[in-house]
């Protein structure tokens, strides 16, 4: 699986998970949440050549089809697969609100 | 919805679902299917900018990080969100066989 | 590298007031949030509050409620801290701690301060 | 606030032991959890932040686990330099209180 065990222990090129710190405030201009400061969401990059995590059978059609035609912009991309929430603190008047945001964290990523 | 009705009647820049016709020889190397020859499989394309179609939490997250950081590798990415089957015809020995391949037309796109 | 350089020891009579300084450099000063925490003498550490320079957002620990102000002037990449009507359990070492990924990564020298009539 | 109570307040070891120390929050700080280690008259060093990550130049014989409530420093091989006294902070939600110190 292109998951952070694997993709953050190797130096793969092909499409896998990346890391990635975003700051609420200055990478966003959050100010709402008031914990944490900022987490680490990570990010899908890579090329997605044929056989390599693929989809459904349209994303293998596209990347064979993109083997046999290499200067055409029809290719599969890198993108999430498996998310996970972040817990978060925010204020509603003076009162602390813990909640849960979903989808939010990117464990794994898929060619599609 | 970034589907066909509405990206191939306009000439929308961002994200949206493209007309891309495959030949299965010419541009898959498939000489196993008997009919059809090839087929309107489309492709999605364009950029994904904050709010155009995304599609969880963690797509709007890294839209604006996008937005406040413009030179960043990290973006969300244009691929299939509605896909349909393809009825296609193949041979075992002298015998015809139908069978419906599944996820291979795209009807829609999606920022992910 | 990332450096934050405070002020020296201070000597103040009590109900008098310190200001203490913390430059910094090697780092992005105005987005990153800035902590002020104190260690009294033989004691663990106290954490006293925050500010983010880029827009003079504070947080305080309510225990220092009125009596202590943080500021950041983004001219000369400095953070100050100021504490009012000193008393002798406010005796200790003040450290500006850069706020850095759930943690406090990069630390001032610390900055003594002695209350004493 | 949320209190940490850090044990054991003192401990003596020996090098090439094992050393285990925990931190306890009061209520559910997730991962949100920093240790540092301070040697006397110096200012402290981040260890390990958000739980478990190692800090940059941190010997990999230093690791952190837990979360929710429960945390623990462990030094798999103890050092003759590793001799300090080490700090919890949890960073959920402020004030951002401190360990009492092992």
């Known amino acids: 699986a292109l998951d952070t065990n694997y993709c953050f222990s190797s130096t793969e090129k092909n499409c896998c998970v990346r890391q990635l710190y975003i700051d609420f405030r200055k990478d966003l201009g959050w100010k709402w949440i008031h914990e944490p400061k900022g987490y680490h969401a990570n990010f899908c990059l890579g090329p997605c050549p044929y056989i390599w995590s693929l989809d459904t059978q349209y994303s293998k059609v596209l990347a064979l089809y993109n083997q046999h035609n290499p200067g055409a912009s029809a290719a599969p991309c890198c993108v999430p697969q498996a998310l996970e929430p972040l817990p978060i603190v925010y204020y509603v008047g003076r009162k602390p609100k813990v909640e849960q945001l979903s989808n939010m964290i990117v464990r794994s990523c898929k060619c599609s | 919805a970034l589907d066909t009705n509405y990206c191939f009647s306009s000439t929308e820049k961002n994200c949206c679902v493209r007309q891309l016709y495959i030949d299965f020889r010419k541009d898959l190397g498939w000489k196993w299917i008997h009919e059809p020859k090839g087929y309107h499989a489309n492709f999605c394309l364009g950029p994904c900018p904050y709010i155009w179609s995304l599609d969880t939490q963690y797509s709007k997250v890294l839209a604006l990080y996008n937005q406040h950081n413009p030179g960043a590798s990290a973006a969300p990415c244009c691929v299939p969100q509605a896909l349909e089957p393809l009825p296609i015809v193949y041979y075992v020995g002298r015998k015809p066989k139908v069978e419906q391949l599944s996820n291979m037309i795209v009807r829609s796109c999606k920022c992910s | 590298q990332v450096l934050l350089v405070q002020s020296g020891a201070e000597v103040r009579k009590p109900e008098a007031s310190v200001k203490i300084f913390c430059k910094a450099s090697?780092?992005?000063?105005?987005?990153?949030?800035m902590n002020w925490v104190r260690q009294a003498p033989a004691q663990g550490f106290e954490w006293m509050g925050q500010?983010?320079?880029?827009?003079?957002?504070?947080n305080y620990n309510g225990k220092f409620k009125g009596r202590l102000t943080l500021t950041a002037d983004t001219s000369t990449n400095t953070a100050y801290m100021e504490l009012s009507s000193l008393r002798s359990t406010d005796m200790a070492v003040y450290y500006c701690?850069?706020?850095?990924?759930?943690?406090?990564?990069?630390w001032g020298q610390g900055a003594l301060v002695t209350v004493s009539s | 606030e949320i209190q940490m109570t850090q044990s054991p307040s003192s401990l003596s070891a020996s090098p090439g032991d094992r050393v285990t120390i925990t931190c306890r929050a009061s209520?559910?700080?997730?991962?949100?959890l920093a240790w540092y280690q301070q040697k006397p008259g110096k200012v402290p060093k981040l260890l390990i932040y958000?739980?478990?990550n190692l800090a940059d130049g941190v010997p990999s014989r230093f690791s952190g686990s837990g979360s929710g409530t429960d945390f623990t420093l462990t030094i798999s091989s103890l050092e003759p330099e590793d001799a300090a006294t080490y700090y919890c902070?949890?960073?959920?939600?402020?004030?951002?209180?401190f360990g009492g110190g092992t």
């Open positions: 701690a850069r706020h850095y990924d759930g943690s406090t990564d990069y």
């Open positions: 090697g780092y992005s000063f105005t987005s990153s949030w």
């Open positions: 500010i983010y320079p880029g827009d003079g957002d504070t």
């Open positions: 209520e559910n700080i997730y991962s949100n």
């Open positions: 958000a739980a478990t």
């Open positions: 902070q949890h960073f959920w939600g402020t004030p951002y209180t």
